[in-house]
Amino acid sequence: REAAPKSYAIRDSRQMVWVLSGNSLIAAPLSRSIKPVTLHLIACRDTEFSDKEKGNMVYLGIKGKDLCLFCAEIQGKPTLQLKEKNIMDLYVEKKAQKPFLFFHNKEGSTSVFQSVSYPGWFIATSTTSGQPIFLTKERGITNNTNFYLDSVE
């Protein structure tokens, strides 16, 4: 049986959701006028970079779009970007596609996503609405790195 990605809506503790703005992801308040993205999540089959203490290795994509999250260095700083890629194309690759990989770890009822390419760097939202989703190594008050994955039918 062919694997299929799981679908989730994603929120942070301040009820900010992820929204597609052009070809980038931003955080916006959960509201009726805003259409949040549905996140596609699928496990990586290759175990080359696996580290169970950090979580399960997953690819993250945007449902309904051939867009996947990946990490690259820009001016010496790890940066979160969206790349035109079908998540299933990543999944079927025998070799793990490291820039697209994240460690998915559960902390209580929340999920945390850490870059495999840049250990210690986590997907985060700012406390300010309308700001891009980004990578941070500073977990805490000013950045939200814990997310709720809400099942969507």
Epitope: A9, R11, S13, R14, Q15, M16, A28, P29, L30, S31, R32, S33, I34, P36, G108, S109, T110, T127, S129, Y148, D150, S151, V152
Partner: antibody, heavy 122, light 111 residues
Amino acid sequence: ELQLQESGPGLVKPSETLSLTCTVSGGSITSSNAYWGWIRQPPGKGLEWIGSIDYTGSTAYNPSLKSRVTISVDTSKNQFSLKLSSVTAADTAVYYCAHGKYYETYLGFDVWGQGTLVTVSS
Amino acid sequence: ESVLTQPPSVSGAPGQRVTISCTGSSSNIGAHYDVHWYQQLPGTAPKLLIYGNDNRPSGVPDRFSGSKSGTSASLAITGLQAEDEADYYCQSYDYSLSGYVFGGGTKLTVL
């Protein structure tokens, strides 16, 4: 049709703990994307949000009451509960439980219990 | 005292139009969180009247409408009827408090 019913003592002594339960019927307390809240209304005054718990078990509390409040869920009984410690006369109010869904009511409350009056007095 | 500010009272004659304002700040209404309105008839529990700024749940007459702009929102009631006499509350979410916030309530009197 979803219905909520508050229950608990109508009289609590000062310094004691107020305990209320909200029984959910016509739906599951673990229903995907649902959140459940406690809201109170002192006699002749406005509504005050006390705290909430959602289907993941995540809780949030009003900062002004946080040190005294605990909200929990009993999935086996399809209930959620409120505990408010060290009560004073200022905690005398009608207490309501309420329901919402993240991607349907957008942080509003669409179903309310009928409310229960709790008086704090010795 | 309330995070959202409403006038304590408004009044109007039957058939008239009245509006109730709700003023918040940049951490709630101004941050683009939705505003919801509740009607509380005497001696009863609040009932959701408007959700998501301007949407009526089924069963709510179209005489009731909501709008939002900047850090404020308003509820309009047209063709005022005696049974509209009630308390009305606005509600939103505040990210700085990580919680739900209510207005102080407005008592509507039908003259």
